[in-house]
Amino acid sequence: KEEQISFRDCAEVFKSGHTTNGIYTLTFPNSTEEIKAYCDMEAGGGGWTIIQRREDGSVDFQRTWKEYKVGFGNPSGEYWLGNEFVSQLTNQQRYVLKIHLKDWEGNEAYSLYEHFYLSSEELNYRIHLKGLTGTAGKISSISQPGNDFSTKDGDNDKCICKCSQMLTGGWWFDACGPSNLNGMYYPQRQNTNKFNGIKWYYWKGSGYSLKATTMMIRPADF
């Protein structure tokens, strides 16, 4: 009888010999619960677990706390992998986070954090980041120190406003802060002077809504 192999992340998938981009079934740490994720096996050596993707506006990202917890969308297109899985995974070992961005003029940039993890749900999936490098700005567009995650029905930001309702989407809002990759998707020629678009301030500045974004993680010792 063939032994059932389970993978915690795309790095393990890659190391097992599966080196083709695509959707793979991953297993929660210390559990039999499964989740489908897209694995990028080509970029920067491969083994990347995609935890977020925006590319065409086909998926609504103004979702509830529960939806951001368990994930939504389609791993082959626009999706959010799920805060609970990412939290559990990134607390098992050290992970890096790479954020890849595209603007509407054909430019690409990235931000790489050498250490990334999310706190538990009890701590509102607070983001923790260290060691920024990359081409998408010398200053982190995710506010430091990291903030709690907020959604339209879970207001944990540092503003006595409701950032998730004002700027749309779930994110680690400050008050409200220089980034939101889960904002409203605006098509070309409608993507400037937007309050609530897909923003990475320290790359594109005020009011610019990006064309595409990918957030991906990989063990630091890969």
């Epitope: 006595i160 400050d174 008050a175 309050f195 301030y201 005020s206």
Partner: antibody, heavy 129, light 109 residues
Framework: QVQLVQSGAEVKKPGASVKVSCKAS????????MHWVRQAPGQGLEWMGW????????NYAQKFQGRVTMTRDTSISTAYMELSRLRSDDTAVYYC??????????????????????WGQGTMVTVSS | SYVLTQPPSVSVAPGQTARITCGGN??????VHWYQQKPGQAPVLVVY???DRPSGIPERFSGSNSGNTATLTISRVEAGDEADYYC???????????FGGGTKLTVLS
Amino acid sequence: QVQLVQSGAEVKKPGASVKVSCKASGYNFAGYYMHWVRQAPGQGLEWMGWINPNSGGTNYAQKFQGRVTMTRDTSISTAYMELSRLRSDDTAVYYCARSPNPYYYESPGYYYPAAFDIWGQGTMVTVSS
Amino acid sequence: SYVLTQPPSVSVAPGQTARITCGGNNIGSKSVHWYQQKPGQAPVLVVYDDSDRPSGIPERFSGSNSGNTATLTISRVEAGDEADYYCQVWDSSSDHWVFGGGTKLTVLS
């Protein structure tokens, strides 16, 4: 922690000017408006105006136009309120208070009227001959 | 300019419910904020955007706003709630903040 610390009490003569400072700490100074509110003895709160520390833009209450000047020094995260041509009825406690600018990174010129979530301890200004 | 009217004083026994009103023309169309000020201290925000509470403010404090009246409600009143309470709105026509005249809440002993 987040706090606003104001300068000490002042005693001034009528016709003089007073400049009160408000030092911010524990947050992104540029991302919050700074307001000035005064309270005469036994009276209510009176809004004087705000400054946007990011741009330096100001909005003064009509009553104080021409007499009040609000400035800031972002390098030391400090806001200032100067009131000139003082009269005896300017005797009051002067407070600074911040309110968030949630659109700071989208459009620095757009004012969002959020409540004042943190206040300074107040500065007593006495105008007397 | 926009005017907010508050009763000068409200008295309530401990454990009872206090209601402080703030009147203004069509105030229901505006966001109302409420501040508590104890003697010799700076004001503290207790309710914002009509009915939301900042972190650290007890659930006993709540707010509502419709028509021409906004109301701050303090349930199960305690002696420590004795203070002046001010309502506040942004008057978009003048681009000015406006405070009500304040209400002194007395907790009867």
